[in-house]
Interface confidence: medium
């Protein structure tokens, strides 16, 4: 019921921003469920989030990338739901389950070409890796109180005002003293009285939706967790300074108790589930060289071991307006010699902790077919071929010419548009094939253009193994073998018999088998046998023989 894909394949036209985004992620849970129409598949990658280019991108200054890379994580839950292992949680993927191939061409599939860019480094966090991924949505940290703003000066002086102000930092109500002006202009101090001061929220409530950014230091290989709060909070055991928790080891849980004077006990217990070290992942180009002209394969590789649960690591890719959620993707039916940009990110417990962009230029494609203008023979030993080169890039030509079962090939310069073939065999059909080729990641041959011609006739070679034998006193039997090269369309053997300078016989047969009778006795004869191909006679084979005296 799906529309038929367009046959044109992926376009490389400039495309609009991708209309996709993800919602806040739920806490990771795995539940057992009966076999059903919608069922967990055996898949290495368990959860993933989408890409939303229209959101604000995280900007990391070049200087900060020297030692540290910034990663954004949201919705850190203070209680980790235990992971219930199921068959689908196996870390070994089933064959083929962890690769997504976009083979074929949906009408709305578009990839952005990226003109003039060099390949981006595939080490996450380095300067050349441009991040286009959005930061995850950040929940409001405090409740904003909307209060009407009344001008106290408009009130009669005798009115005792109670003004409630919102402390945007603390987000709780307090009492305050307000100075108002009477109509006469004299200042009246009125004491504000509130019967009950509203209680402060608990720190557990206030910081329920606290978000965290992880900063990774490539030298120390430790993380710093930056707490996204508006005020300077206090952490139990003095584990944080300036809202940062330092020296966190990858793949270890750290517990932080967060408090502030704007909230009451109980404190917020924040569990920091520290992701794996960034340098342990590398975005690898897994494209097969033979297919590199029309396909792109990208795969995240774990280049070092770590103790984090791999089931909690998920991967996502965005190439043009296509979104994939696998560790490895394969794009097919692409245009040769085009740059394509794919953005990818890795999530740990549904929170992004690293990303990389890869610009890949597809390899040179096979050159097109040359256009043969003419192909002919104007002489017995020569032929000529002229052509127009193909449109696509190529390095050289290969010209092959085949006669019967023999094949000879020549490598020709790319600038040639004509070639004269020499030393050909006369009256022979030659089949010519001309193709351009390019040496890229592998040599790619273009389609061959074909033509044929037959060389002109030439004199045949000499007959051979000629014999003259006497069959009777006045009769001779002349035989010979065909010429090695006939060099023409027809096949006829001629025998000329001379006595002195006089031609006494001239015979022509289909075969070189002549019976010459009624010759004169005791006479010297010259026998000349040659082949005629319909256009040219060959060199004669000459033998001398004499008749004997008549025996009767």
């Amino acid at each position: 019921q799906s529309p038929t894909p367009s046959p044109t394949g992926l376009t490389t036209a400039k495309m609009p921003s991708v209309p996709l985004s993800s919602d806040p992620l739920p806490t990771h849970t795995t539940a057992f469920s009966p076999a059903s129409t919608f069922e967990r598949e055996n898949d290495f990658s368990e959860t993933t989030t989408s890409l939303s280019p229209d959101n604000t991108s995280t900007q990391v200054s070049p200087d900060s990338l020297d030692n540290a890379s910034a990663f954004n994580t949201t919705g850190v839950s203070s209680v980790q739901t235990p992971h219930l292992p199921t068959h689908a949680d196996s870390q070994t993927p089933s064959a083929g389950t962890d690769t997504q191939t976009f083979s074929g061409s949906a009408a709305n599939a578009k990839l952005n070409p990226t003109p003039g860019s060099n390949a981006i480094s595939d080490v996450p966090g380095e300067r050349s890796t441009a991040s286009t991924f959005p930061t995850d949505p950040v929940s409001p940290l405090t409740t904003t109180l909307s209060l009407a703003h009344h001008s106290s000066a408009a009130l009669p002086a005798r009115t005792s005002n109670t003004t409630i102000t919102a402390n945007t930092s603390d987000a709780y109500l307090n009492a305050s003293e307000t100075t108002t002006l009477s109509p006469s202009g004299s200042a009246v101090i009125s004491t504000t009285t509130i019967a009950t001061t509203p209680s402060k929220p608990t720190c557990d409530e206030k910081y329920a939706n606290i978000t965290v950014d992880y900063l990774y230091n490539k030298e120390t290989k430790l993380f710093t967790a930056k707490l996204n709060v508006n005020e300077n909070v206090e952490c139990g055991n003095n584990t944080c300074t300036n809202n940062e928790v330092h020296n966190l080891t990858e793949c270890k849980n750290a517990s932080v108790s967060i408090s502030h004077n704007s909230c009451t006990a109980p404190d917020k217990t924040l569990i920091l589930d520290v992701p794996p070290g960034v340098e342990k992942f590398q975005l690898h180009d897994c494209t097969q060289v033979e297919k590199a002209d029309t396909t792109i394969c990208l795969k995240w590789k774990n280049i070092e071991t770590f103790t984090c649960d791999t089931q909690n690591i998920t991967y996502r890719f965005q190439c043009g307006n296509m979104i994939f959620d696998n560790k490895e993707i394969k794009l097919e039916n692409l245009e040769p010699e085009h740059e394509y940009k794919c953005d990818s990110e890795i999530l740990y417990n549904n929170h992004k902790f690293t990303n990389a962009s890869k610009i890949i230029k597809t390899d040179f494609g096979s050159p097109g077919e040359p256009q043969i203008i003419f192909c002919r023979s104007e002489a017995a030993h020569q032929g000529v071929i002229t052509w127009n080169p193909p449109q696509r890039s190529f390095h050289n030509f290969t010209l092959c010419y085949i006669k019967e079962t023999e094949k000879d090939c020549l490598n020709l310069d790319k600038n040639l548009i004509k070639y004269d073939l020499q030393n050909l065999k006369p009256y022979t059909k030659y089949v010519l094939s001309l193709h351009a080729y390019i040496i890229a990641k592998v040599q790619r041959n273009g389609s061959a253009a074909m033509c044929h011609f037959t060389t002109k006739s030439a004199p045949p070679s000499q007959v051979w193994n000629m014999t003259v034998s006497m069959t009777s006193d006045n009769s001779m039997h002349v035989k010979c073998r065909p010429p090695r090269d006939r060099n023409g369309p027809h096949e006829r053997y001629h025998l000329e018999v001379e006595a002195g300078n006089t031609l006494v016989r001239n015979e022509s047969h289909k075969n070189c088998d002549f019976r010459v009778k009624d010759l004169q006795y005791s006479t010297d004869y010259t026998f000349k046998a040659y082949f005629h191909n319909g256009d040219y006679p060959g060199e004669p084979f000459i033998l001398h023989h004499s008749t004997s005296y008549n025996s009767k």
């Epitope: 993800s22 055996n42 993933t48």
Partner: nanobody, 125 residues
Framework: EVQLVESGGGLVETGGSLRLSCAGS????????VGWFRQTPGKEREFVAS????????YYADSVKGRFTISRDNGKNTVALQMNNLKPEDTAVYFC??????????????????WGQGTQVTISS
Amino acid sequence: EVQLVESGGGLVETGGSLRLSCAGSGRTFSSRHVGWFRQTPGKEREFVASIRWSGGHTYYADSVKGRFTISRDNGKNTVALQMNNLKPEDTAVYFCAAAVRLTAPLNFDTSYDYWGQGTQVTISS
């Protein structure tokens, strides 16, 4: 034979809410993603939202982000689309689709193997 049946469509005023449900029945199969698409007359199917069956991760089109929520119920074998703050431009036939083995981008209808018959959603202004 796998069957997907949508329900919950209807007529609602601008700003109102509807909850669509997609029930899967028939021969069991392993679905990787279940998605909702919509179509108006003379136009191609448009991606609305999808959910990854294992892990429940969700994707939305920008046009519905923040207003629609896709969810799954493993036990009942259903996928729901909660639509809030509906607008006249949300008027369409809504289709539920399931992808057994997603071999193409999850936001393309060509990636999905099974489709329901659709349910009409009309938003009056």
